[in-house]
């Protein structure tokens, strides 16, 4: 008799999910020689007891803090750029300006991008049919929980100047909602940060609007000002003309605004 | 066959600078990090600080402020300097290459380092 | 005083078997490979296990690794008085950005 499971409304388990994971990290380890050492089974092993029998609505971050021991990393704090809604890229430009960091270049967030992974209460099984959804279905489930751990350890991480990466092209281009919104805006130490810069990324070819005006960035400079951050805002209108001049700053056509 | 080869004053005087050169013969240089580590008569091995062949170094925090480890890839050589020694710092001193297996897979053969007034 | 700890000495007689254990915390032992080295007076160390549980041609099968949490062990079988030497753990520490040694074992073969 088949054994009663239950059904989430979200996509199940990535397929070759530990096989990804642990490839993962050992393809990040031998890129990053700082990270050289990482015993990659450990991690994996510290991965697995996060969520495997475990309720998967019911994730702690508490569940998480052996392997945040285990995925220890020092990145430059003022070299850090978070994004929302804009994840390419953010990630683009990081190939490219290979000093700044976005939570995807670090161990922890290269390990889980783009995955899903959840598993069911009191059995070592991982679900590869279905996963809780924030939304319909919990909030607290492995995925959501990993990824507000990771990224309000990265924000708190952060000094100096911080950059953020929005997406103009959406109704709200700062969402309260978002893991920035909700999370990142919301652990920057201001005892650390000086300014969290905002690239808002256009994305109409003949959008000449300066989206720095919008009411959404607005509340944002709000979030921040009473946070004792100083806030600036910069309009990227030529998206692909940006990353080709932090490719090549020499070019005579970058002195002009992008 | 790889073999490391290292050679520098055995006898040094208080606060006068340690200075120890390794050699690698029969191998390849780049894509390593090569190390020094030390032991002093009686005690156990404590590591000193690397660097690979692009000059990227890490260092012991507790001697971090006396050690410069340098590298010249044109002779396939890193180099060790300690400086202001003490009595504290005879020990003999090894030269190591941490292989791509996360560990030392081959030494020097080691030189004794005395500070004597 | 290391931040990785080994017992100071061991000893078993010929023929027996013998552990050494080496402890640590989540910033070395917890999320690095861990290595043992056998040092015999006189001579450069020479290694004996490297990624907690691998042996390097030419290491004999009576030596054995492995590693749970933050501890790592040594393990040897089928004692030979030719084994009388210190041993030594060693990992990588992520929050020192370096590497360190447990404090060394010398192991006496009755």
């Known amino acids: 008799v088949p054994r009663w499971r239950q059904q989430w409304s979200g996509p199940g388990t990535t397929k070759r999910f530990p096989e990804t994971v642990l490839a993962r990290c050992v393809k990040y380890t031998e890129i990053h020689p700082e990270m050289r050492h990482v015993d990659c089974q450990s991690v994996w092993d510290a991965f697995k007891g996060a969520f495997i029998s475990k309720h998967p609505c019911n994730i702690t971050e508490e569940d998480y803090q052996p392997l945040m021991k285990l995925g220890t990393q020092t990145v430059p704090c003022n070299k850090i750029l978070l994004w929302s809604r804009i994840k390419d890229l953010a990630h683009q430009f990081t190939q490219v300006q290979r000093d700044m960091f976005t939570l995807e270049d670090t161990l922890l967030g290269y390990l889980a991008d783009d995955l899903t992974w959840c598993g069911e209460f009191n059995t070592s099984k991982i679900n590869y049919q279905s996963c809780p959804d924030w939304r319909k279905d919990c909030s607290n489930n492995p995925v959501s929980v990993f990824w507000k751990t990771v990224s309000r350890r990265f924000a708190e991480a952060a000094c100096d100047v911080v950059h953020v990466m929005l997406n103009g092209s959406r109704s709200k281009i700062f969402d309260k909602n978002s893991t920035f919104g909700s999370v990142e805006v919301h652990n920057l130490q201001p005892e650390k940060v000086q300014t969290l810069e905002a690239w808002v990324i256009h994305g109409g070819r003949e959008d000449s609007r300066d989206l720095c005006q919008d009411p959404t960035i607005k509340e944002l400079e709000s979030i921040i000002s009473k946070r004792n951050i100083q806030f600036s805002c910069k309009n990227i209108y030529r998206p692909d003309k940006f990353l080709q001049c932090v490719k090549n700053p020499e070019d005579s056509s970058c002195t002009s605004e992008i | 066959q790889v073999q490391l080869q290292q050679w520098g004053a055995g006898l040094l005087k208080p606060s006068e600078t340690l200075s120890l050169t390794c050699a690698v013969y029969g191998g390849s240089f780049s894509g390593y990090y090569w190390s020094w580590i030390r032991q002093p008569p009686g005690k156990g091995l404590e590591w000193i600080g690397e660097?690979?062949?692009?000059?990227?170094?890490n260092y012991n925090p507790s001697l971090k402020s006396r050690v410069t480890i340098s590298v010249d890839t044109s002779k396939n050589q890193f180099s060790l300097k300690l400086s202001s020694v003490t009595a504290a710092d005879t020990a003999v001193y090894y030269c190591?290459?941490?292989?791509?297996?996360?560990?030392?897979?081959?030494w020097g053969q080691g030189t004794m380092v005395t500070v004597s007034s | 005083q290391s931040v990785v700890t080994q017992p100071p000495s061991v000893s078993a007689a010929p023929g027996q078997k013998v552990t050494i254990s080496c402890s640590g915390s989540?910033?070395?032992?917890?999320?690095?490979?861990v290595s043992w080295y056998q040092h015999l007076p006189g001579t450069a160390p020479k290694l004996l296990i490297y990624d907690n549980n691998n042996r390097p041609s030419g290491i004999p099968d009576r030596f054995s690794g492995s590693k749970s949490g933050t501890s790592a062990t040594l393990g040897i079988t089928g004692l030979q008085t030719g084994d009388e030497a210190n041993y030594y753990c060693?990992?990588?520490?992520?929050?020192?950005?370096?590497?360190?040694f447990g404090g060394g074992t010398k192991l006496t073969v009755l």
């Open positions: 060693a990992t990588w520490d992520t929050s020192l950005s370096g590497w360190v």
């Open positions: 660097i690979n062949h692009s000059g990227s170094t």
């Open positions: 989540n910033s070395n032992i917890g999320s690095n490979y």
């Open positions: 190591a290459r941490e292989g791509l297996r996360h560990s030392f897979d081959i």
